[in-house]
Interface confidence: medium
């Protein structure tokens, strides 16, 4: 399996909410001995190996934000800790998983990584990640809504907040 990032760049105004998304592609084993660990973290731009550094998102580590379940099951992070920081990660039945960040500030700008680890009992792990950039803007030239730029082309499209 592999991870796809539908959008490589999110440009959002300060104070807006945004949902960063990754998608699990390819065959996914659904056996009893297979579970999936999905999480999010920040990383540094310009690394030789993108996403190799794991930094917290709003003081929450990748362990705090993880989802742990089998196959294409739906899951959400435990609400209390994450929601106090304006965060929520979620996963659906179709392999999509996301992190929602509320009330964006300029400090939220940066490179975000999603990580999927396939854990087979008595076997080795298989891990893949995806990366995307979030730019939070302020001032009269910041967009009114979050604008997302697809990974495959330069066309942009709006996520309508209202």
């Amino acid at each position: 399996f592999k991870v796809a990032t539908p959008y490589s760049l999110y440009v959002c105004p300060e104070g807006q909410n945004v949902t960063l998304t990754c998608r699990l592609l390819g065959p996914v084993d659904k056996g009893h001995d297979v579970t999936f660990y999905k999480t999010w973290y920040r990383s540094s731009r310009g690394e030789v190996q993108t996403c190799s550094e794991r930094r917290p998102i709003r003081n929450l580590t990748f362990q705090d934000l993880h989802l742990h379940h089998g196959g294409h099951q739906a899951a959400n992070t435990s609400h209390d800790l994450a929601q106090r920081h304006g965060l929520e990660s979620a996963s659906d039945h179709h392999g999509n998983f996301s992190i929602t960040m509320r009330n964006l500030t300029l400090l939220d700008s940066g490179l975000y990584c999603c990580l999927v680890v396939e854990i087979r009992h008595h076997h080795s792990e298989h891990r893949v990640h995806g990366a995307m950039e979030l730019q939070v803007q302020t001032g009269k030239d910041a967009p009114s809504n979050c604008v997302v730029y697809p990974s495959s082309s330069q066309d942009s499209e709006n996520i309508t907040a209202a």
Epitope: G86, N103, Q137, G139, V147, N158
Partner: antibody, heavy 118, light 112 residues
Framework: QVQLVQSGAEVKKPGASVKVSCKAS????????MHWVRQAPGQGLEWMGY????????EYNQKFKDRVTMTRDTSTSTVYMELSSLRSEDTAVYYC???????????WGQGTTVTVSS | DIVMTQSPDSLAVSLGERATINCKSS????????????LAWYQQKPGQPPKLLIY???TRESGVPDRFSGSGSGTDFTLTISSLQAEDVAVYYC????????FGQGTKLEIK
């Protein structure tokens, strides 16, 4: 550079309707909300409402809710503000203003004077 | 609706002197989550559309002279012109965008 060009002055009779246009250029039209603000002679600024050009979603000042309609044409990057059942108190300069990410009116049209007189 | 009240309605200040305009909102404009006040100041000269000066209560818009400054939080805000210039003669408006949008009634600034 960002430009908002509004339609010309209008003279209308009470009870009629007026439709003012605002053509945008120099930026991606669908990325920014457009607001309408009016100013009666010698008076202050009054926010009328906004339209999200991407979705067409509108939100209006309660004062104008039953009389105002804001629309957009993405093919020409133009927004429209129509005000119906005009009365003399609607005599004003009507401005379109582009929203920025800090909920700012950072760019304004030149204004359209609407005179309501019998 | 949030009501914005400016004071004074008009103000005459000598060239080179300080001008201060106040704006009070009927409820707090502070978003505590991002420590941001949804309050902006605009300048309008005769026959022209308004021009953005200050946003988020205290952030000066690019290109605006540094003699203009904004301060305050919550419900009480101030626009200060540290040394009045002839070109600063105008009407000044505060505007809230915390809950939809409302302008103050305006303050007319003249030279004494």
């Amino acid at each position: 550079q960002v430009q908002l060009v509004q339609s010309g002055a209008e003279v209308k009779k009470p009870g009629a309707s007026v439709k003012v246009s605002c053509k945008a250029s120099g930026y991606t039209f669908t990325n920014y909300w457009m607001h309408w603000v009016r100013q009666a002679p010698g008076q202050g600024l009054e926010w009328m409402g906004y339209i999200n050009p991407s979705s067409g979603y509108t939100e209006y000042n309660q004062k104008f809710k039953d009389r105002v309609t804001m629309t957009r044409d993405t093919s020409t990057s133009t927004v429209y503000m129509e005000l119906s059942s005009l009365r003399s108190e609607d005599t004003a300069v009507y401005y379109c203003a582009r929203d920025g990410g800090s909920v700012l009116f950072g760019y304004w049209g030149q204004g359209t004077t609407v005179t309501v007189s019998s | 609706d949030i009501v914005m009240t400016q004071s004074p309605d008009s103000l005459a200040v000598s060239l080179g002197e300080r001008a201060t305009i106040n704006c009070k909102s009927s409820q707090s404009l502070l978003n505590s989550g991002i420590r941001k006040n949804y309050l902006a100041w605009y300048q309008q000269k005769p026959g022209q559309p308004p021009k953005l000066l200050i946003y988020s209560a205290s952030t000066r818009e690019s290109g605006v002279p540094d003699r203009f400054s904004g301060s305050g939080s919550g419900t009480d805000f101030t626009l200060t012109i540290s040394s009045l210039q002839a070109e600063d003669v105008a009407v000044y408006y505060c505007k809230q965008s915390y809950n939809l949008y409302t302008f103050g009634q305006g303050t007319k600034l003249e030279i004494k």
